[in-house]
Every structure is written in C-alpha cells, then in structure tokens.
C-alpha cells in the first residue's frame, strides 16, 4: 500500500467515542426480548432449546463476519428431577402422621439422593458463623436456611460440617419480596465448578478417564422449597428467629415436640451434550494473545436476568467490535474471543470444561476474562469483583463511563478497591482466576438487595423490564464498561495489567499474619523467609516497571517479552504444590483449600481458639509452601534465571 492509503492511527479518545456512538444506536432490549421468546425458553443445559440458541449465536457470530467461528462439544453429567417427585413432609414422631408440605417445583442439582427424617432447625443463611451462633445443635437434624449471602453449595457444605442430615432452602419475603409465595426455584450444590464427575480434567467424548467424583459434591440431600412451604413448616416450629436476622415475622427456630420433618430427594443423573460457541476477532500484532469475553447461555427457568442479558451483551459487543474493525479502522493488537457457555446453571460447567481442556496452555495465551453474566440486575449501584491485576483498568473505566441514570461518573469512591468482594464459586470468572490463573473480572449494575427472580420461573423479560424500566440504558452502560475493558486490553502496547497491585495484597496478608508472630515464635518458626519472598516480589515488580519505562515502545519483540512476564503473574500465584485434580482452585489468594493464604490464617487462629484442632505439622507445610509460591511468583516476574538473586 502507498503511504497515502495507510489506516490513520486511532487513539484512545477516538476509540472511546467510536464505541460510545455505536452503542448509542444499539437496541439491547429487543435482543434480550428475542432471547426470551418461547423458542429459546426454558433452555436447561443440553436441551433442544439450549441447542437452538447455540445455533442462533453461532449464526450471529458468522453474520458479524468474525475472523473465525467454532464450537466445542462436551459430554457432561448433570442432575435433573425424576418423575417420582421430591417431597417434604411433616410427620409425628411416631410416624403415623404424614402431612405433605410440598412436592417442590424446583430442585438442587447434585443433591445426594436420600430420605431423611429428623428435627428441623433454622440456621439463617447457613454461613459458618450462623451455625456457630445456633443454640440448638444441628447434628442429626435437618436444617432450613434462607437463600442469599452465600452459594447453595456453601450452605450445604457448612450444614454437612455441622453434621446436619439434610438441607431445605427457601426465599424469605424480606430479602426476596416476591408476591407469589408458591414460586419454586433452582440451584446446584457442587462446591466447585465444572462437571463434578470429571474433576480437574475435561469431559470431551474421547477422553477415557476412570470414574471420578468431585470432593465438592454433598453427601446429604438438599432441596429448595417455596416460601409457602417454609411458612407451613414454621407453623410446626417454635422460638422466634432473632430480630437481627431481619427476616419475616413467621420465621421460627426449631420443630415443636412430637414433630419431625421428612425430606425425600430422588433426582437422576443425566449425561448431556453441551455446546460452547466461540467467535474471534484476530489481533493485528499478537493474534495469539487474547482477551476472552463470555456469557452463560443456558437457564433452568426463563433466565432473562440470569442469561439473556449477558448473551445479548455478548452478541451486541461482537457486532460492535466487528464493525469497528471492518468498517472503522480499529486494529486491535491482540485478539478478542467471544464465548457463549452452556451448563452455567450447574456450576460454570461449559466455561470450566473449556479451561480444563486447555489447562497447560491457556494462561500463556488468554490474559483476561470478562464475564458478562448477570451484568444488569438493577440501576442503583455499580459493583465489581476482579483480580487485583485489573483494578487500575477498572478504575480508569469507572472514571470514563457515566451512570446510565444519574449521568455521574461510575467512579464515586476513591476507596472502592477495598470494598471489592472476592469472586465466588457461582461466578464464571472464578475458575478463570482460581483454576487457570487468568485475571478475570465480573461486574453488575444492581441494587442493595438481591434481584429476587434469579433461578426462579419468574426470571422473565416482563419482570425484568418492570423492575428495570431503563433496561436499555443500563445494558448500554454495561456494554460500554465491557467494551472499554476490551479496547484498553487489546489496543495498548503495554498490557493493561497492574502487577504492582499484588504488593499491597501481600503486605495485607503479612500484616494479618504478623498478629500471630508470638505463636509463630513459640513453634520455633520465623517469618523472615516470607518477608524475603515478599521483598523479592516487590523488587521484581519495580524492576519490571523500570524495564517498561526504559524500553522502546515500538520494539515489538521487547514489548512482547515484557508483556509475557506480566501475563504470568496471576498464573504463578497458583500453588504448584497441589494437584489441579484434587484441589482445582490453586490460587493462593482467591482459590479454596488448605494451600490458600486465608486457610493458613484460619488454621493459625485455631492455635489460640481451639488448640486441639490445630495441626502444627500441617501449619509448617502451609507456611513453607506459601513462602515458596510467593518466591516462585517473584522469580517468574524477574525474568531470566540469570537475573534472579538465589540467596534465598
């Protein structure tokens, strides 16, 4: 091409304006509405309607003229309701009385199949603290808990730890103000993500793995019940619930004398084929480095807020970015992968299976995951959960994007980062971060209260537009947030990952650990090596910043080498000392298991509060392995081995 034909260089302000103008003309609500038409609803994972929507998305990606569109098939096990209904009954202690409370319309996937009978005890939300605070012992009893605050899986795991024999979950009117008390709802009880019968490895059809079972599966039955059913149970219970629970006045604590509750669950396992649909806009400089933008497609109920909003955002962003590239001269350096996952309702199964399939290589190529799920649940607040590597990017974006209703900047609190909540198991971003070591972000426009219809048959477009009349504006703002992330991550020469943020995370951990220095001394241990590792990490980040400053931005080779060092930061916080199969969420900050820094602190606390439960040998291991993981991250960031000070 002649010099005259050169595509003019587009700068951040040009791209930001371009994105904004394109989004101004996008009709998000009609796409959301389309995705909630009868031909696509309900779309339980693996169902015909889920597949119909997969085909539609694949078609749309092709019509967007993305560089490449493809699909991944996985064969996974889910749990569905049997034709024999699950039941909750009240019985007399002599079992002659059998009063049906409910044959629930919903269910909890991956529940243990069993029939259990016993006293029923209310355990509030079912958090660890809730169980600790109970006056009535729950061992040998069923527990009833409110939905909210933590995932179903965590509620069940906590109940199991307290030796409960079964769990009932309901939505109280105070937290979930749904008029119809008979509304049923759905969830899953796998304390993990992915197919629980192929833990830590992918479930492609041709992989001949031996039968296996995730340790995160519950060993007790669990069932969701309607509020009407809960109220009927409360009629047979006594003791008012504590006022600080802030729940319905009907709430009661424990079954009356001569009364028992019987829970019968008989769900069935079903192997299904799920489809993940992908489309890519290839980068112009480093096409083998990509940001992944994903959304859950399936849903047990209509799933308007749960999956249609995210899927609509995914489709519209694919169209917008394709137009920016093909028509408006945007040349992203790195690639953008658009992903539509299935079986999200069963614990981010589609997303996790993809990650498991490419475990050894994905962190070398994918440098960020942007989750679009449940991005619009209200209007009042903008909330975000993410890896600290993305905090700087998030802050810049919050300063740039205006609130869809107030018109003010989303950046209203300079202390926002300290209020960021950890990604939880029920978020598709969690496995990216905690399993694969890929920086991930999930955000939402939401209220102080939970969106009441998630996981229910009432999660319809009609209810969504009624709850959020300015749905189009809010969806547009969500698209702008994600779009700005995508531009900044693929356009800038220097990778927009703030590796220095982990210095303050490490410092915070050491501050917490330092409170127990007397205990550590008494065990004849020292924190010197941990401080040394932390110091090495700090020096490595400083050196990398200096290297960036001193490098020639036009030298692609040098910039790629520096960016590759940045890309490895998150990955190197995955503990190399635990098996991805036994402990898939290896991240020492954000994962789960005894290798995490929070587990180390919780364990050390026991030395004072419950000495019999404290295991010094285990603690010594935890401390040593945490130290080495941090040291390893420092070494990886430093670059080549001849640059690493090996005095350690």
């Amino acid at each position: 091409k002649d010099d005259d034909d050169k595509v003019p260089q587009l700068y951040w302000d040009d791209l930001k304006k371009m994105l904004s103008e394109k989004l101004d003309t996008t009709d998000f609500t009609s796409t959301i509405k389309l995705l909630n038409e009868n031909s696509y609803v309900p779309r339980e994972a693996g169902s015909q309607k889920d597949e119909n929507l997969a085909w539609y998305i694949e078609n749309q990606f092709r019509e967007c003229k993305l560089s490449k569109v493809w699909r991944d098939e996985h064969f996974v096990k889910i749990q569905v309701k049997d034709s024999a209904q699950n039941s909750v009954t009240i019985t007399g202690t002599n079992s002659e009385f059998v009063y049906l409370v409910e044959n629930p319309g919903g269910y909890v996937a991956y529940s243990q199949n069993a029939t259990v009978t016993g006293k029923l005890v209310h355990a509030n939300f079912g958090t660890e603290k809730d169980f600790e605070d109970l006056d009535s012992p729950v061992n040998g009893s069923l527990v009833i808990v409110r939905a909210g605050k933590i995932t179903f899986a965590e509620k069940v795991a906590n109940a199991e730890s307290a030796n409960a024999i079964g769990v009932l979950i309901y939505m109280d009117k105070t937290k979930f103000p749904i008029v119809d008390a008979d509304v049923s709802f759905f969830g899953h009880a796998h304390l993990g993500t992915g197919d629980p019968y192929t833990p830590g490895f992918p479930s492609f059809n041709h992989t001949q793995f031996p039968p296996s079972r995730s340790s995160g599966l519950p060993n007790i039955p669990v069932q969701t019940i309607s509020r009407a059913a809960a109220e009927r149970l409360f009629e047979n219970m006594e003791g008012d619930c504590p006022s600080d629970w802030k729940t319905d006045s009907s709430c009661r604590m424990v079954t009356s004398q001569n009364k028992s509750v019987k829970l019968s669950v008989s769900n069935v396992m079903k192997e299904i084929k799920i489809l993940n649909i992908f489309g890519v806009i290839k980068g112009f400089v480093e096409p083998d480095r990509y940001v992944v933008v994903g959304a859950q497609r399936d849903s047990w109920g209509p799933g308007a807020a749960k999956s249609s909003v995210g899927t609509a955002l995914l489709l519209e962003l694919a169209q917008t970015f394709s137009d920016m590239v093909l028509k408006d001269g945007f040349q992203p350096s790195r690639s953008i992968v658009f992903a539509s996952w299935s079986a999200g309702d069963f614990g981010s199964v589609g997303a996790t299976e993809w990650l498991e399939g490419y475990l050894s290589s994905l962190h070398l190529k994918a440098f960020t995951f942007i989750n679009l799920d449940k991005a619009v649940l209200g209007t009042s607040n903008f909330r975000v959960s993410a890896s600290p590597l993305l905090y700087a990017l998030i802050e810049k974006t919050m300063q740039e994007v205006k609130h869809p209703v107030t018109g003010l900047s989303l950046y209203q609190d300079s202390n926002w980062a300290s209020k960021v909540e950890k990604l939880t198991f029920d978020n598709a971003a969690f496995p990216f971060l905690a399993y694969s070591g890929i920086p991930a972000v999930s955000f939402c426009f939401c209220e102080d209260t939970d969106y009441p219809y998630l996981g229910t048959t009432m999660d319809t477009y009609k209810e969504l537009i009624e709850k959020i009349p300015q749905l189009n504006k809010v969806a547009r703002a969500a698209a702008e947030v994600a779009g700005q992330f995508m531009i900044k991550l693929t356009h800038d020469v220097e990778l927009n990952l703030d590796y220095e943020r982990y210095n303050s995370q490490l410092l915070s951990f050491l501050r917490n650990l330092n409170q127990y220095r007397a205990d550590i001394r008494e065990m004849g241990l020292s924190l010197q090596w941990l401080y040394s590792a932390r110091g090495d990490f700090f020096r490595a980040t400083s050196r990398l910043t200096t290297d960036f400053k001193n490098s020639e931005k036009t030298d692609r080779f040098v910039m790629k080498e520096l960016n590759d060092r940045v890309m490895k930061v998150e990955y190197y916080f995955l503990s190399p000392y635990v098996s991805p199969r036994e402990s898939p969420f290896r991240h020492i900050f954000w994962g789960s298991g005894s290798h995490t820094l929070s587990a180390l602190l919780e364990h050390l606390k026991l030395r004072k509060t419950n000495n019999r439960a404290f295991n010094e040998t285990l603690f010594r291991n935890q401390l040593a392995l945490a130290t080495w993981t941090i040291q390893g991250a420092a070494n990886a960031l430093s670059g080549d081995i001849w640059d690493i000070d090996n005095e350690f």
Partner: antibody
Framework: QVQLVESGGGVVQPGRSLRLSCAAS????????MHWVRQAPGKGLEWVAV????????YSADSVKGRFTISRDNSKNTLYLQMNSLRAEDTAVYYC???????????WGQGTLVTVSS | QSALTQPPSASGSPGQSVTISCSGT?????????VSWYQQHPGKAPKLMIS???KRPSGVPDRFSGSKSGNTASLTVSGLQAEDEADYYC????????????FGGGTKLTVL
C-alpha cells in the same frame, strides 16, 4: 373456594354395602390428608377413618375396622368410603373433612345421611 | 360413652366469658398438643375454631382461645355473642395400638 361434596348416602338394609364419595375442589386434593367423620342423629361426632395424602397409610376406628375401607383417587379429586356389613348403629350423617395438619379438620362437606334399617 | 369428657352444657350472658373443659388422659390430651375445637350450629357441618390446643385459624374471632393444663384442654369464649350459641366439640389424637381420633361428647353453649 374449597368445596367438599358428599354423595352416595341412602337407606340400606343391615348386612348390605354402600359406597360414599366426596368430590373435592378449590384446593390441591392430592396434598392433604382426608377423613370421614360421622354423627348419629341427635348424638356427638365420631371419627371413622383417615387416609394420608398419597394413600400410603390408612387407619380406621375400631368400631368399623374390617368393614369400612377408605380410599382416594387423586386424579379424580375424590375420596371414598366403602361400607360393608352395615349395622343399625352405623346410621348417621357422614362427613368428609380435610385435615391440613395435626387432625385439624378445617373444611367439612355438608354431609350425607346413611340409614341402616330393615 | 365418649373417651373425652366435656360438660353437657354451659351458659353465659352476652359480653361474659365462658370456659368449656375437655378432660382426657396422658395418652391423648395430656400427651400431645393435637387438640382441636369445633363449633356446630343445628343442621350444619362442624366448623374448626381452634387447632393444636391454641392456634386460631384465620377468620375465627379472637374472642375464642384455647389452652391446656395437664390432661385437660379448655376453650374460652370471651365477650359472648348471640351467634356463639351452638354445640362445641373437642377432639384429640390418642396414642394406642391403633391410630385413633377421639371426640368429646359435646357441650351445648347457651347465650342467655
């Protein structure tokens, strides 16, 4: 609204049989326990039989045991009482009643009169 | 003869309170809280007034209350009104070899 309508009563000779029906509407019949209660003319109430929501358990009073059988058809929302070997002392108004829980009969039919007489 | 013992009659003037007793044993009234009270007007089906000793179903005036002490249950009607004149029956579960529901012989309440 909840409605229970008994039918099948009448005059019958001792030793003969009769089948009472109770048609239910206005509630989820298949979810509730159902009872038959009788009342002899000018006398008090006497419990006759119970059947649990799914028909799994049935119990009857000693005075009718072996002669009367309670049953239900949840698909038809109907409760039945098969009365065999009828005696003069079985003469009464027979009521069907819904038991939401703990023997609290919150809805009753209008009753059907059974007269056992030769 | 009924297994639960009720007085055959009780009376009171409008506005007054009346209590009807229902005596049983430790195998029925005393052993379980499954005591109900029914009101029956002549020629009509019975109506549930109290369940589980003291629970009042919706629609029943709060003038009606139930209680239990030992093997005896009681129904109290306060602020008597003319329409309260009726027969009142107590019932209870009895723990025996056979599942059993007992009724009292009934109390005729007269409003003077």
């Amino acid at each position: 609204q909840v409605q229970l309508v008994e039918s099948g009563g009448g005059v019958v000779q001792p030793g003969r049989s009769l089948r009472l029906s109770c048609a239910a509407s206005g509630f989820t019949f298949s979810s509730d326990a159902m009872h038959w209660v009788r009342q002899a003319p000018g006398k008090g109430l006497e419990w006759v039989a119970v059947i649990w929501y799914d028909g799994s358990n049935k119990y009857s009073a000693d005075s009718v045991k072996g002669r009367f059988t309670i049953s239900r058809d949840n698909s038809k929302n109907t409760l039945y009482l098969q009365m065999n070997s009828l005696r003069a002392e079985d003469t009464a108004v027979y009521y069907c009643a819904r038991d939401r829980q703990w023997l609290a009969f919150d809805y009753w039919g209008q009753g059907t009169l059974v007269t056992v007489s030769s | 003869q009924s297994a639960l013992t009720q007085p055959p009659s009780a009376s009171g003037s409008p506005g007054q309170s009346v209590t009807i007793s229902c005596s049983g044993t430790s195998s029925d009234v005393g052993g379980y809280n499954f005591v109900s009270w029914y009101q029956q007007h002549p020629g009509k089906a019975p109506k549930l007034m109290i369940s589980e000793v003291s629970k009042r179903p919706s629609g029943v005036p709060d003038r009606f209350s139930g209680s239990k002490s030992g093997n005896t249950a009681s129904l109290t009607v306060s602020g008597l009104q003319a329409e309260d004149e009726a027969d009142y029956y107590c019932s209870s579960y009895r723990d025996s070899n056979n599942f059993d529901v007992l009724f009292g012989g009934g109390t005729k309440l007269t409003v003077l």
